[in-house]
């Protein structure tokens, strides 16, 4: 018996027919058997192609020039499979071959209809005859797979794949990939606390996963310009508290634990309009929520000589997110968004829930994806219930103090703004946005029996914000902008400018009020020069919740050349603070306004990419940021 | 009886579209490839278009590549040759032929009788 | 795509002569050569597969061999009926190809 392959190595291209032949001559007179069997190649050639080959098999093979690594091995080593075998002239193919165009036809020829990926490797052709046991009963041909398809071809008619072997192919192929999924990720990574990670966590930062899908809804309805119908998980909390002529909203405010306070990294430069939110935790043994009603008691108290009086006399000021830079609390002012939002129930206005969360009762610790159970959302939504006149007793805290007023206010930050100034602080700083200093020795609350602000925040951060007590306030309008036709005329917001005297412009709101009275036929107004996407949404099917939060400039008529110098304001903020505008709600009447935390990431390169976005987009609102 | 029959030739404008069918019957239409050969007038035999047992694999010569498809209806035992951008030297006879065995397309052991196809303005 | 070339183009011999016909490859096409027979107004007939092998039906004065690039087509004792032309065709390597043909004439 003599078989013989007259081809030792035959090369045939991708999804394309190929003949293995495979003669034999034999002296029996029986019908031989045909089989044909795969072999795998011992090593991976692509391997080879792309460098990675053992350095033991390159040294074996530079030894025995006979020996070759990737088709010299023992079959425990690698994949073996019958392909077909023919008896007289049935044919019968292997279990992996069943369904594939192959047969054995002209003696011993192995034909395959199509070729795929796996069938690059070694083929041999073993003749079985009865009575003629001498002699060689086998052969081999090594078959390779080239990676040229009709489609490669006629999308790339130029690129010669003919001369390319199958495996330098498939590495070109797993190469792409690769680098596709580390473009995703890394592109993923930049935003993970974005939106983006709202729904799936992020590989990279799988603990930055803080936004809830609520936030997502409320920033879609704003853009939209309609109050949304908020549902899902709740935001963080909420301080309700009255706006300066704010419209009518819910506020929010949840007895749970807070994660503790993510070390801040930091942010510089780059456009506006990236949202950068805090990720606070909570502490065991302190709520946050007595922070905010400390302050806000405190700042309801604060020297009635210097206050304003008259038309804000039944407003509080409103408590943003805490921030933990530096021990500080900020405040910024925003802007508002002349459109009404529905009203809903005052938590604030339940003793019941007050006396819960002066309690201290603060559970454990959660992580950074704030996770509400159903019954916490059925129990929040039962505590929003509340009626109207019920929700209006929040007034008698109010009144009985008078409120504080803008001016008042900036004084309230300038008293307390006199710490250390950045080096670099530049008259840029006025525009990165207006952010109070509360001394530390003030930080003591009587809510901390058990430690202080200090604690609470952590000591030791280097980064300061620039003061404000040089500066004063002023409202300026700002120049005209194209805006969606549903949107309301928007005051132009609080700006800091260096040498003004602390006075408030009474007749700016006065007008304001008036072209309330007449949206429909206002005339548009001005925005910032950074408007911004949503800040957050809060609790589950309440009535509109948004968070607000500082903006990232305040010109007073500022040229929009200027806008390259804001990449140094943003040195000024601290990380994770907001940076953009949300755009509020003007209303004739006192209302309660909810407030949120929303949590952004500081990322640079998606501050380059984001396009500006068309002022008037989104609600912002006056907040202090405590 | 083991036969070929085409069908579907004609006179054509240069440009124009044609599709022959091939009938099979007397074997197991699904267990062999299939080709088309044509013979222009008094010419020699030129190979054009094969296709394997199942229609998983095509081939054409690079005289008609990506103006003929080559098709097969196994549950019809019919095999099928879409012209289309005719050209003058298209012009002669098209055979549809049987392999003589297996999938691909290699020795042909019956051919049918032809259809004419002219293509001309 | 392998080229075959037939030789003579054409050819005119009596009855009873030996006629033989050579076929060459452009590159190896081992022994995947098939000789056809096509009868004036007819569709060709298979003669010889794999090179050498008769099928089925055919006279045995017909014989063919070769391998490699050269084959050869071998009449013994040509009759009028073995008027016609006679193709090589490679299988070898896809897409089966055909040689010019040799138009065979009796005298």
């Known amino acids: 018996l003599q078989v013989t392959v007259p081809d030792k190595k035959k090369v045939a291209m991708l999804f394309q027919p190929t003949v293995l032949r495979c003669h034999f001559s034999t002296s029996s007179h029986q019908p031989a058997v045909v089989q044909w069997k795969f072999k795998s190649y011992c090593q991976d050639r692509m391997g080879e192609s792309l460098g990675m080959s053992s350095p033991r098999a390159q040294a074996l093979s530079k030894r025995n020039l006979e020996w070759d690594p990737y088709l010299d091995c023992l079959d425990s080593r690698r994949t073996v499979r019958v392909v077909a075998s023919k008896q007289g002239s049935t044919v019968t193919l292997g279990d992996f071959y069943r369904g594939r165009e192959i047969t054995i036809v002209h003696d011993a020829d192995l034909q395959i209809g199509k070729l795929m990926w796996g069938d690059s490797g070694l083929y041999y052709c073993i003749i079985t005859t009865p009575d003629d046991l001498e002699g060689k009963n086998e052969d081999s041909v090594e078959l390779l797979v080239l990676g040229r398809t009709g489609l490669l071809a006629d999308l790339l008619p130029s690129f010669a794949v003919e001369i390319m072997p199958e495996w330098v192919f498939v590495g070109l192929v797993i190469l792409g990939i690769f680098l596709f999924f580390v473009l995703v990720g890394i592109c993923w990574c930049q935003c993970c606390p974005h939106s983006c990670c709202c729904y799936v966590r992020c590989p990279c930062c799988p603990d930055s996963c803080c936004c809830p899908q609520a936030l997502y809804e409320a920033g879609k309805a704003a853009k939209a310009g309609y109050p949304p119908s908020v549902s899902g998980v709740p935001g963080p909390y909420s301080i309700p508290s009255v706006p300066l002529g704010g419209a009518p909203s819910s506020g929010m405010l949840m007895d749970k634990p807070h994660p503790p306070p993510l070390a801040p990294s930091d942010s510089t430069g780059g456009s506006h309009s990236v949202r950068k939110g805090y990720r606070i935790q909570a502490d065991k043994e302190r709520d946050s929520m007595k922070v905010l009603y400390y302050v806000e008691k405190e700042l309801a108290q604060f020297d009635p000589a210097r206050r304003m009086r008259g038309r804000y006399n039944n407003t509080i000021s409103e408590l943003s997110s805490l921030h933990d830079d530096d021990s500080n609390f900020r405040q910024s002012y925003h802007q508002m968004r002349n459109k009404q939002f529905p009203m809903s129930g005052d938590l604030e206005s339940n003793p019941d829930y007050w006396s819960g969360v002066m309690g201290g009762n603060s559970g454990t610790n959660r992580g950074p994806a704030l996770e509400y159970n159903k019954e916490d959302r059925e129990s929040f939504r039962h505590s929003q219930q509340r009626s109207k006149s019920e929700m209006l007793s929040r007034k008698n805290f109010a009144t009985g103090v008078p409120a504080v007023s803008m001016d008042e206010l900036a004084a309230f930050a300038d008293s307390y703004g006199q710490r250390s100034r950045r080096a670099n602080g530049n008259s840029h700083e006025a525009r990165a946005g207006s952010r109070f200093e509360r001394s530390e020795s003030r930080a003591h609350g009587a809510f901390y029996q058990d430690g202080s602000l200090d604690e609470y925040y952590g000591r030791g951060r280097s980064r300061e914000p620039p003061g404000d007590g040089e500066r004063g306030w002023t409202y300026s309008p700002a120049p005209a902008r194209r805006r969606p036709p549903e949107d309301a005329p928007l005051p132009r917001l609080v700006s800091r400018t260096p040498g003004t005297a602390p006075k408030y412009d009474h007749s700016y709101l006065s007008s304001v009020l008036e072209r309330q009275a007449r949206p429909e036929s206002s005339s548009r107004g001005g925005s910032l020069e950074t408007p911004s996407k949503l800040g957050a949404q809060l609790g589950p099917r309440s009535a509109s919740y948004y968070a607000w939060s500082p903006p990232t400039t305040y010109k007073a008529g500022a040229s929009e050349g200027e806008d390259e110098d804001d990449a140094a304001d943003e040195d000024a903020l601290p990380p994770y603070s907001e940076l953009e505008l949300s755009r509020g709600e003007l209303s004739r009447g006192p209302s309660y306004r909810g407030r949120d935390l929303s949590f952004h990431s500081n990322s640079e390169k998606r501050r380059k990419k984001e396009p500006a976005k068309k002022p008037g987009d989104f609600p912002t609102r006056m907040s202090l940021v405590v | 009886e083991v036969q070929l029959v085409e069908s579907g030739g004609g006179v054509v404008q240069p440009g124009g579209s044609l599709r022959l069918s091939c009938a099979a019957s007397?074997?197991?239409?699904?267990?062999?490839?299939m080709s088309w050969v044509r013979q222009a007038p008094g010419k020699g035999l030129e190979w054009v278009s094969g296709i394997s047992s199942s229609g998983g694999s095509t081939q054409y010569a690079d005289s008609v590549k990506g103006r003929f498809t080559v098709s097969r209806d196994n549950s019809k035992n019919t095999l099928y040759l879409q012209m289309k951008s005719l050209r003058a030297e298209d012009t002669a006879l098209y055979y549809c032929?049987?392999?003589?065995?297996?999938?691909?397309?290699?020795?042909?052991?019956?051919w049918g009788q032809g259809t004419m196809v002219t293509v001309s303005s | 795509d392998i080229q075959l070339t037939q030789s003579p183009s054409s050819l005119s011999a009596s009855v009873g002569d030996r006629v033989t016909i050579t076929c060459q490859a452009s590159?190896?096409?081992?022994?995947?050569l098939n000789w056809y027979q096509q009868k004036p107004g007819k569709a060709p007939e298979l003669l010889i597969y794999?090179?050498?092998t008769l099928e089925s039906g055919v006279p045995p004065r017909f014989s063919a061999s070769g391998s490699g690039t050269d084959f050869t087509l071998t009449i013994n004792s040509l009759q009028p009926e073995d008027i016609g032309r006679y193709y090589c065709q490679q299988y070898h390597i896809p897409p089966p190809s055909f040689g010019g043909g040799t138009k065979l004439e009796i005298k």
């Open positions: 590159q190896d096409t081992n022994k995947y």
């Open positions: 032929a049987k392999d003589f065995v297996g999938v691909l397309p290699d020795a042909f052991d019956i």
């Open positions: 007397g074997f197991t239409f699904s267990s062999y490839a």
């Open positions: 794999g090179a050498s």
